[in-house]
């Protein structure tokens, strides 16, 4: 069967929403009222990978765009990017590892760990309107905890 994809939005633990910042970058900032319509809607696909009750492998595409979050090495550092793909071939059940995130939910906290780079997480800064990035620390200054709102 084809891969199942569901639409959702994400907010970090500070309740910042994610929006596009240029063609290939996301940033996190506080939105309210009608401005919430600016937030990115993800198409979250349930993909192949090691799975448990608390950990589910997913790919995060942007709804109605052929862009996926991916993790690659840049200057020897794991880096989060938005990568353009051929919409005829994506999403698929066996996504390349750079596109796969372990969605981990424990005690009301949702984290997205890179499958390619274990212990590196989708992160936001405390500061407003800063880029979403791949961070290698949890529980520090940067935010790695999110909530997810599924949408129609």
């Amino acid at each position: 069967a084809p891969v199942r994809s569901l639409h959702c939005t994400l907010r970090d633990a500070q309740l910042k929403s994610l929006v596009m910042s240029g063609p290939y970058e996301l940033k996190a900032l506080h939105l309210q009222g009608q401005d919430l319509e600016q937030q990115v809607v993800f198409s979250m696909s349930f993909v192949q990978g090691e799975e448990s009750n608390d950990k589910i492998p997913v790919a995060l595409g942007l709804k109605a765009k052929n862009l996926y979050l991916s993790c690659v090495l840049k200057d020897d550092k794991p880096t989060l990017q938005l990568e353009s793909v051929d919409p005829k071939n994506y999403p698929k059940k066996k996504m390349e590892k750079r596109f796969v995130f372990n969605k981990i939910e424990i005690n009301n906290k949702l984290e997205f760990e890179s499958a390619q780079f274990p212990n590196w997480y989708i992160s936001t800064s405390q500061a407003e309107s800063m880029p979403v990035f791949l961070g290698g620390t949890r529980g520090g200054q940067d935010i790695t905890d999110f909530t997810m709102q599924f949408v129609s």
């Epitope: 569901l6 959702c8 009750n53 009301n108 906290k109």
Partner: antibody, heavy 119, light 107 residues
Framework: EVQLVESGGGVVQPGRSLRLSCSAS????????MSWVRQAPGKGLEWVAY????????YYPDSVKGRFTISRDNSKNTLFLQMDSLRPEDTGVYFC????????????WGQGTPVTVSS | DIQMTQSPSSLSASVGDRVTITCRAS??????LTWYQQTPGKAPKLLIY???TLADGVPSRFSGSGSGTDYTFTISSLQPEDIATYYC?????????FGQGTKLQIT
């Protein structure tokens, strides 16, 4: 025995609030996504709220979004549905059900609690 | 949103009869389909998921089949305790929606 028991239903005027509870037993509550499904009198079933096992994921259809809030207390094996700004069309039996977004189906259901919104 | 249409909306059959209910989705749901049984005044009960997998403890006289947009629920030999309303539900994309139900009665 796996069991879900709802409570908190009743008769309420339009615009008022009601809070439903669902007590779970016989399984490890904190490991399961949970949902509320309602059934209007003589009608079919409508999925009205979902919360993931840890509480970080939620879903509401447009018909209740902004008015209903689902929450859970895993330490007390209890699911809640806070219903505000109630409308006559919210009248029905509200079922607590195990399952939701990830699994997709509902494998355990409570007996339901009736809610009537009328002036 | 994907809409689910069940047919017939009601039917009468005799004990021992083979009974078939169909469910049509407005789009391809790739076997992400469940069937529930609801007896009067009771909660729904899961019978079948993933179009054809029988839930734990469900008698083998119940079965499901289909693919794409068209699915079938069958009771091979109707028993008196099968009097109920049956619902299909898809879980391919949010919102997961239910069919309007098929009320099964015994003649």
């Amino acid at each position: 025995e796996v069991q879900l028991v709802e409570s908190g239903g009743g008769v309420v005027q339009p615009g008022r609030s009601l809070r439903l509870s669902c007590s779970a037993s016989g399984f490890i509550f904190s490991r399961y996504d949970m949902s509320w499904v309602r059934q209007a009198p003589g009608k079919g079933l409508e999925w009205v709220a979902y919360i993931s096992h840890g509480g970080a994921g939620t879903y509401y259809p447009d018909s209740v979004k902004g008015r209903f809030t689902i929450s859970r207390d895993n330490s007390k094996n209890t699911l809640f549905l806070q219903m505000d700004s109630l409308r006559p069309e919210d009248t029905g039996v509200y079922f607590c059900a195990r399952g939701g977004v990830t699994k997709g189906y509902f494998d355990v259901w409570g007996q339901g609690t009736p809610v009537t919104v009328s002036s | 949103d994907i809409q689910m249409t069940q047919s017939p909306s009601s039917l009468s059959a005799s004990v021992g009869d083979r009974v078939t209910i169909t469910c049509r989705a407005s789009g391809n749901i790739h076997n992400y389909l469940t069937w529930y049984q609801q007896t009067p005044g009771k909660a729904p009960k899961l019978l079948i998921y993933n179009a054809k997998t029988l839930a734990d403890g469900v008698p083998s006289r119940f079965s499901g089949s289909g693919s794409g947009t068209d699915y079938t629920f069958t009771i091979s030999s109707l028993q008196p305790e099968d009097i109920a309303t049956y619902y299909c539900q898809h879980f391919w994309s949010i919102p997961y929606t239910f069919g309007q139900g098929t009320k099964l009665q015994i003649t």
